[in-house]
């Protein structure tokens, strides 16, 4: 059976297509090509007489067609108007005609696309951005890429307008991109230049560094403030509520106890109009901000009740500290038999009684810090029960 085949079926505009003929019958008088799905004299492209090997252009001939002795038809420099059906009529020597229809599709060579946007400076968490891939062309597939990857599944991403428009709902600072669109058809593909979003955000709550609270007199106080923000935040400092300066860094040399107080960093974003503050307390003191763990020692840890006495000593190398004692979570002294001496470093119990058995510990502290010793256990024994009514124990 007579058939035709388009080589290629999808043709790029400006290129050429060959309509190949298969199963051409023998004993031919000639053949004719027509534009369309049927034989129509008004739409004849070319006729060919085998006897004379003569090609005769028809009304639909554009001068770009070449017919070959094997009946194949070459069309050069194709346009989108050439898309469609082509019919070959074969005239046999017995004047019985055979027909075959083929087709091809012409697609444009796609230009480099570009991305337009409805909002070049969106505000985080509020604005939506619609990207549109230009130009709009027929029979074209539109694809989008974010960070060189295909679109993730997200309720914040919407495709519309035949995938030509990508909308980001409620943009975040992580949505900067880059964004690219790609257009494809069966004969070509092209990708846009990348576009990035300038997302306005912040300021976030500022952080003041370093984190130290305690400083010694004579030291230099150097504080730095940072808040994530786009555009970058403008900073100002207040000390105890009084404005000091509009800088990111605050430096005070040779501080004294008078520099103690609340230090406020104020961050402002002039575009979003938002402000955030952080307050840090600074304490300037000779006192050690970290009190070492004291050691507790006992003259004896096992004593005889109503007979022995015991001395407990709390040792520390820190100066400017105070000491307090605890027994079974109660503050001491708790009876006439307990005495504190040597600046509370020593706790004396005389005499020791049964109720004094248990866990003791001491705590050293200054106005800004404290620390506790490990506990020590005092055991109280009774060698014999006291005699009553002249009777011996037993």
């Amino acid at each position: 059976q007579l058939t035709t085949e388009s080589m290629p079926f999808n043709v790029a505009e400006g290129k050429e297509v060959l309509l190949l003929v298969h199963n051409l019958p023998q004993q031919l008088f000639g053949y004719s090509w027509y534009k369309g799905e049927r034989v129509d004299g008004n739409r004849q492209i070319v006729g060919y007489a085998i006897g004379t090997q003569q090609a005769t252009p028809g009304p639909a001939n554009s001068g770009r067609e070449t017919i070959y002795p094997n009946a194949s038809l070459l069309i050069q420099n194709v346009t989108q108007n050439d898309t469609g059906f082509y019919t070959l009529q074969v005239i046999k020597s017995d004047l019985v005609n055979e027909e075959a229809t083929g087709q091809f599709h012409v697609y444009p060579e796609l230009p480099k696309p570009s991305i337009s946007s409805n909002n070049s400076n969106p505000v985080e968490d509020k604005d939506a951005v619609a990207f549109t891939c230009e130009p709009e062309t027929q029979d074209t597939t539109y694809l989008w890429w974010i960070n060189n990857q295909s679109l993730p599944v997200s309720p914040r991403l919407q495709l519309s307008n035949g995938n030509r428009t990508l909308t980001l709902l409620s943009v975040t600072r992580n949505d900067t991109g880059p964004y690219e669109c790609e257009i494809q058809n069966p004969v070509s593909a092209n990708r846009s230049d990348p576009v990035t979003l300038n997302v306005t955000y912040g300021p976030d709550t500022p952080t003041i560094s370093p984190s130290d609270t305690y400083y010694r007199p004579g030291a230099n106080l150097s504080l730095s403030c940072y808040a994530a923000s786009n555009p970058p935040a403008q900073y100002s400092w207040l000390i105890n509520g009084t404005f000091q300066q509009s800088t990111q860094e605050l430096f005070i040399p040779n501080i004294t106890v008078n520099n103690s107080g609340s230090y406020t960093c104020h961050a402002n974003n002039s575009v979003t109009g938002c402000n955030r503050t952080t307050v840090k307390t600074i304490i300037v003191t000779e006192l050690s901000p970290v009190v070492a763990k004291p050691q507790i020692k006992a003259s004896k840890t096992t004593v005889t009740g109503d007979k022995d006495s015991v001395n407990l000593t709390c040792s520390t190398n820190d100066t400017g500290i105070s000491i307090r004692w605890f027994f079974k979570n109660q503050s001491l002294p708790s009876s006439e038999r307990m005495k504190l001496s040597q600046g509370n470093t020593t706790l004396s119990i005389n005499p020791v009684k049964r109720e004094d058995a248990g866990t003791y510990w001491c705590e050293v502290f200054n106005p800004i810090s404290k620390n506790q010793s490990d506990p020590i256990m005092l055991n109280v024994n009774y060698n014999a029960l006291p005699q009553e009514n002249g009777l011996s124990p037993g």
Epitope: S116, N118, N119, V123, K126, D127, A128, A130, T132, E136, S160, N161, R164, T165, T167, L169, S170, T272, G273, C274
Partner: antibody, heavy 121, light 107 residues
Framework: EVQLVQSGAEVKKPGESLKISCKGS????????IGWVRQMPGKGLEWMGI????????RYSPSFQGQVTISADKSISTAYLQWSSLKASDTAMYYC??????????????WGQGTLVTVSS | DIQMTQSPSSLSASVGDRVTITCRAS??????LNWYQQKPGKAPKLLIY???SLQSGVPSRFSGSGSGTDFTLTISSLQPEDFATYYC?????????FGQGTKVEIK
Amino acid sequence: EVQLVQSGAEVKKPGESLKISCKGSGYSFTSYWIGWVRQMPGKGLEWMGIIYPGDSDTRYSPSFQGQVTISADKSISTAYLQWSSLKASDTAMYYCARGYPAPTVNDLDYWGQGTLVTVSS
Amino acid sequence: DIQMTQSPSSLSASVGDRVTITCRASQSISSYLNWYQQKPGKAPKLLIYAASSLQSGVPSRFSGSGSGTDFTLTISSLQPEDFATYYCQQSYSTPLTFGQGTKVEIK
């Protein structure tokens, strides 16, 4: 039920100031934008601007920038439109409307009943 | 600013008629077009959002289509309560802009 209730009609003289209100209820007032739309007598609709009550972010139409001030008080779920010095050409019906989810790519799905402002000497 | 042009500015129709109103944007607005209905002395009411999505509670005789620059509002069978003025509005970019309106009157 979502409702936007606007303050009543006003008759003012040129040069006077005015602040009209729009109170939202039945939804999270701070999560939606509130837009203002002007309709002059016998004319079409004109978008004036929009505010996000959550943080008072405001966007104006260039035609109305500097002519009016849009504000909001989220503690009482109310948006405002104000003039510092009225002109006779400000005579119109003013509508507030709820916008979602952004200042753009949105729709105005609920409208107030309108406030008629008449400026005449 | 994006200009929105509606046509016709007014039309006369009978109950049961199929009515079509068109709206053209001065630049591509993707599918970010809304349609509103306004009756005399009343606030506008949202009918269609995002070019073709029917707002909750709006009768199905209203439909919208189009993308890019050309959009259409269709009322498949006009009812007595549909006589009103219809506005298109783009929400692609600020300032949001409305068409000049189309008044649908009783023939």
